[in-house]
């Protein structure tokens, strides 16, 4: 038998993916476990194999359909169970009634690009990926810029309180290498959390013109 405290956390990406992490103190590493998803009002169900991500936690992705298909709606409730094999039988280790649109974590923004760069400013755009049409424009973004000699953790956060898929970075230093990241969060959902940070976009400001005041 598996003892210890159990934690089972899942997020819906708003389209066709539910990602889950299950943590269990004292669990056996070599036990075979799965997440089973049973929607209350759909004809399908789905299973994924939990794979170890650390000493006592496992993760898997329930792929519900093609990436941009709307597989669950605001009124769906999905019963999620962690099932582990014990000999010839399966034992239920955790269960939750999952409201997808109360537990959202979108995919990281993609297609970051420099639209225009100058000596002191840079205009950057991005796209959101696999986000439901349900959100309309009710999304917010956080962005951060990595300056030379600093870490990402030290970078101040810039908040965009609306669906604005671009930013104009100001007061930059000429001829300097920077990196930029952005993440997204819907307003909907009690347990909704920020997406992962996007892949960093590297850019360099233009050098100051010689013999000119900057």
């Amino acid at each position: 038998a598996v003892n210890g405290t159990s934690r089972f956390t899942c997020f819906y990406n708003s389209r066709a993916n539910i990602s889950c992490v299950w943590s269990q103190d004292g669990a056996l590493q070599d036990t075979s476990c799965q997440v089973h998803a049973w929607p209350d009002r759909r004809r399908w169900n789905q299973t994924c194999e939990l794979l170890p991500v650390s000493q006592a936690s496992w993760a898997c992705n329930l792929i519900l359909g093609t990436p941009d298909s709307q597989k669950l709606t605001a009124v769906d409730i999905v019963t999620l169970r962690v099932m582990c094999r014990e000999g010839v039988r399966w034992r239920m280790m955790a269960i939750q009634d999952f409201k997808p649109f109360e537990n959202l974590r979108l995919m990281a923004p993609i297609s970051l690009q420099v639209v225009h760069v100058e000596t002191h400013r840079c205009n950057i755009s991005w796209k959101i990926s696999q986000a439901s049409h349900y959100f309309e424009r009710h999304l917010e973004f956080e962005a951060r810029t990595l300056s030379p000699g600093h870490t990402w953790e030290e970078a101040p956060l810039m908040t965009l309180k609306q669906k604005q898929e671009w930013i104009c970075l100001e007061t930059l230093t000429p001829d300097t290498q920077y990196e930029f990241q952005v993440r997204v969060k819907p307003l909907q959902g009690e347990f909704t959390t920020w997406s992962p940070w996007s892949q960093p976009l590297a850019f360099r400001t233009k050098p100051a013109a010689l013999g000119k005041d900057t």
Epitope: Q70, T73, F101, Y134, F135, Q188
Partner: antibody, heavy 117, light 107 residues
Framework: EVQLVQSGAEVKKPGATVKISCKVS????????IHWVQQAPGKGLEWMGW????????EYAPGFQDRVTITADTSTDTAYMELSSLRSEDTAVYYC??????????WGQGTTVTVSS | EIVMTQSPATLSVSPGERATLSCRAS??????LHWYQQKPGQAPRLLII???QSISGIPARFSGSRSGTEFTLTISSLQSEDFAVYFC?????????FGQGTKLEIK
């Protein structure tokens, strides 16, 4: 500019069926939800249901489920709400509205339906 | 279904003063509460979403707050165009339900 333009007022006899249209413009109808809301005289708002044009699904409030049908024609960017077995208490203004599933961002001007023998 | 109770049914306030409208849910609805304004002969207009997020284009004098299952719409300094009926709506549980409305009238 987002617009939802509804069909004109209707007078119906008890037991009849009414079908109201809602022609939209200013946004991509194929990727939208259209809701329908009832407002009876001197009463509050009652949510009837929605159609999700992308998912191709409808949701109905239990109080209307047996009598209401919401449809959409994506070729003309028009949503429809049909209410059958009309009774006097169905006399109301009916609104279509665009929104996510959770709230209604833009509303039509309303269609008055009078049920009288 | 969740019952939304608005109070008072009618509120009389003088222009320039503050108005405070209340909406209580019969069970916990997190922040899934939205406010609408309706003027006579017009369709409702969305004002506030998720308890406190203002919709773009809505004047800054409109604000929302939450304490448990009680939600408040505050209009800081009433203008003549603010006298209307205000509805709250929950989207936590299906079917979504509206309050019966608070009529804000000129004192």
């Amino acid at each position: 500019e987002v617009q939802l333009v509804q069909s004109g007022a209707e007078v119906k006899k008890p037991g009849a069926t009414v079908k109201i249209s809602c022609k939209v413009s200013g946004f991509n109808f194929k990727y939208s939800l259209i809701h329908w809301v009832q407002q009876a005289p001197g009463k509050g708002l009652e949510w009837m249901g929605w159609i999700d044009n992308e998912a191709g699904e409808t949701e109905y409030a239990p109080g209307f489920q047996d009598r209401v049908t919401i449809t959409a024609d994506t070729s003309t960017d028009t949503a429809y709400m049909e209410l059958s077995s009309l009774r006097s208490e169905d006399t109301a203004v009916y609104y279509c509205a665009r929104g996510g599933p959770w709230f209604l961002s833009y509303w039509g001007q309303g269609t008055t339906v009078t049920v009288s023998s | 279904e969740i019952v939304m109770t608005q109070s008072p049914a009618t509120l009389s306030v003088s222009p320039g003063e503050r108005a405070t409208l209340s909406c209580r849910a019969s069970q916990i609805i997190s922040n899934n509460l939205h406010w609408y304004q309706q003027k006579p002969g017009q369709a409702p207009r969305l004002l506030i979403i998720y308890g406190l997020q203002s919709i773009s284009g809505i004047p800054a004098r409109f604000s929302g707050s939450r304490s448990g299952t009680e939600f408040t719409l505050t209009i800081s300094s009433l203008q003549s165009e603010d006298f209307a009926v205000y509805f709250c709506q929950q989207s936590n549980n299906f079917p979504y339900t509206f309050g019966q409305g608070t009529k804000l009238e000129i004192k």
